[in-house]
């Protein structure tokens, strides 16, 4: 008995071939001997089966002795043994129809679980193997689960169903809803304008939801909301903004926030949370702000940084084109009685300068100038 695997919703063509290469009488029946279709001369006739409106054949092939049964919009319950009667002989074809669906929605939030469920006919014992867009293989039976979806899981999942040494392939497009970056860090000199951007890693026609930037300043005892907003069809509208700092927000995607001035009291880390309509759970992106200040008070030249810096970062003070006078893995460095000239304060990571602030030290009889 020939075995053919089909996919739910697809079209399948079951073949039946006569030894004579001409149009002769044929019938297709199911296992209950109910006629599905056949011919009367050059006319297609249909029986009383449940497949009536979905069954067809290819008249153009009859003259060649081919009498296929075409079943459209396959259903799991179409799984059956189909019998082709032609030239006093019977050809049996076992059709097994499978369906593979994602748990609820193919648009899932980062960190959520994806469950793929296999629909299969009674009596079958298929095995399933799925390959994620990043090449990860998962195997299972009737259900396959992937917990903690990551951004790289976005794309086409290819799943192969194996039964009776035959296989059928399913392709499911999964969209992982996430920000492009889980975390970002902005380095600014005191007084500079700060731009925070929160690009999304997906595109959908209509994007509606709401969100908030919650901020923990390094110098504050508690965290607070800096801004709340709504998102309607990709249009951003501010709901409430704190008075200090007075953030501004772009009206279009990507989500974009502007802090007019980087000040030590704002240095710290924030969490932008976005809740999307009809989704349980939220998207998060962490953002960090590091602020640098270089000052000269009497005979003391000081450079300080505020905000979340890693212990391996180096803070240095150096006179332009000279070796660093002081260099420490600390958040403040200073030089007593600095020479006149242009001094540079540098925050660096393994030699790469992240932030630089220049301060001009004048001869001792005059006051310093900040360029």
């Amino acid at each position: 008995k020939k075995v053919v695997l089909g996919k739910k919703g697809d079209t399948v063509e079951l073949t039946c071939t006569a030894s004579q290469k001409k149009s002769i009488q044929f019938h297709w029946k199911n296992s209950n001997q109910i006629k599905i279709l056949g011919n009367q001369g050059s006319f297609l006739t249909k029986g009383p089966s449940k497949l009536n409106d979905r069954a067809d054949s290819r008249r153009s092939l009859w003259d060649q002795g081919n009498f296929p049964l075409i079943i459209k919009n396959l259903k799991i319950e179409d799984s059956d043994t189909y019998i082709c009667e032609v030239e006093d002989q019977k050809e049996e074809v076992q059709l097994l129809v499978f369906g593979l669906t994602a748990n609820s929605d193919t648009h899932l939030l980062q960190g959520q679980s994806l469950t793929l469920t296999l629909e299969s006919p009674p009596g079958s014992s298929p095995s399933v193997q799925c390959r994620s867009p990043r090449g990860k293989n998962i195997q299972g039976g009737k259900t396959l689960s992937v917990s903690q979806l990551e951004l790289q899981d976005s794309g086409t999942w290819t799943c192969t169903v194996l039964q009776n040494q035959k296989k059928v392939e399913f392709k499911i497009d999964i969209v992982v809803l996430a920000f492009q970056k889980a975390s970002s860090i902005v380095y600014k000199k005191e007084g500079e304008q700060v731009e925070f951007s929160f690009p999304l890693a997906f595109t959908v026609e209509k994007l509606t939801g709401s969100g908030e930037l919650w901020w923990q300043a390094e110098r504050a005892s508690s965290s607070k909301s800096w801004i709340t907003f709504d998102l309607k069809n990709k249009e951003v509208s501010v709901k409430r903004v704190t008075q200090d700092p007075k953030l501004q927000m772009g009206k279009k995607l990507p989500l974009h926030l502007t802090l007019p001035q980087a000040l030590p009291q704002y240095a710290g880390s924030g969490n932008l949370t976005l809740a999307l309509e009809a989704k349980t759970g939220k998207l998060h992106q962490e953002v960090n702000l590091v602020v640098m200040r270089a000052t000269q008070l009497q005979k003391n030249l000081t450079c300080e940084v505020w905000g979340p810096t890693s212990p391996k970062l180096m803070l240095s003070l150096k006179l332009e084109n000279k070796e660093a006078k002081v260099s420490k893995r600390e958040k403040a460095v200073w030089v007593l009685n600095p020479e006149a000239g242009m001094w540079q304060c540098l925050l660096s990571d393994s030699g790469q300068v992240l932030l630089e602030s220049n301060i001009k030290v004048l001869p001792t009889w005059s006051t310093p100038v900040q360029p």
């Epitope: 509606t208 939801g209 607070k224 809740a275």
Partner: antibody, heavy 119, light 107 residues
Framework: EVQLVESGGGLVQPGGSLRLSCAAS????????MSWVRQAPGKGLEWVAN????????YYVDSVKGRFTISRDNAKNSLYLQMNSLRAEDTAVYYC????????????WGQGTLVTVSS | DIQMTQSPSSVSASVGDRVTITCRAS??????LAWYQQKPGKAPKLLIY???SLQSGVPSSFSGSGSGTDFTLTINSLQPEDFATYYC?????????FGQGTKVAIK
């Protein structure tokens, strides 16, 4: 520790006035929106009014508009509710509430002060 | 004004039971929804904000879900201290409005 302590409640005749006060401590009062929420005896919660950080924005429920005034004194860490033309239906426990939770949630509540309007 | 309708108005349950309270907004409020717990003679306490986020210090047996107009508060395994009245509240537009409350009583 965040603390909100209401005072000024009591018995007042219909048409009379009362001024409720709320003393805040344990947080930077001037950085938060504040609200008044009331609860009639045996009934549910009803939001009454709120005020932004510096007092330049105020919002009220329709039933108290023109009769109640919310205000604040950041130097004294205090929130106020001036209630005029009081009616029997204003009888309730009045809570002073901080709007400091994430997503505009009401995160800290005072213990409440009872206002009874009766002749 | 946005009307918030809670159901049921009261529910009797036993310790260990799973209790579900629903809240429906008269118009879409995105995720601007909070849930509060109030015990007799006490001030309300914030449990859930942004429809599904658990307030710090609140037991994980409490969970919230929903967005738009339909929201749910679930208490997974009812503890003796959970017998109280629960309110939903929208912060989408002024005036803020509360549901009428759901009393969770001992069966």
């Amino acid at each position: 520790e965040v603390q909100l302590v209401e005072s000024g409640g009591g018995l007042v005749q219909p048409g009379g006035s009362l001024r409720l006060s709320c003393a805040a401590s344990g947080f930077t009062f001037s950085s938060y929106w504040m609200s008044w929420v009331r609860q009639a005896p045996g009934k549910g919660l009803e939001w009454v009014a709120n005020i932004n950080e510096d007092g330049s924005e105020k919002y009220y429920v329709d039933s108290v508009k023109g009769r109640f005034t919310i205000s604040r004194d950041n130097a004294k860490n205090s929130l106020y509710l001036q209630m005029n033309s009081l009616r029997a239906e204003d009888t309730a426990v009045y809570y002073c509430v901080r709007e400091g939770g994430q997503w505009l949630a009401l995160d800290y509540w005072g213990q409440g002060t009872l206002v009874t309007v009766s002749s | 004004d946005i009307q918030m309708t809670q159901s049921p108005s009261s529910v009797s349950a036993s310790v260990g039971d799973r209790v579900t309270i629903t809240c429906r907004a008269s118009q879409g409020i995105s995720s601007w929804l909070a849930w509060y717990q109030q015990k007799p003679g006490k001030a309300p306490k914030l449990l859930i904000y942004a429809a599904s986020s658990l307030q710090s210090g609140v037991p994980s047996s409490f969970s919230g879900s929903g967005s738009g107009t339909d929201f749910t508060l679930t208490i997974n395994s009812l503890q003796p201290e959970d017998f109280a009245t629960y309110y939903c509240q929208q912060a989408n537009s002024f005036p803020w409005t509360f549901g009428q409350g759901t009393k969770v009583a001992i069966k």
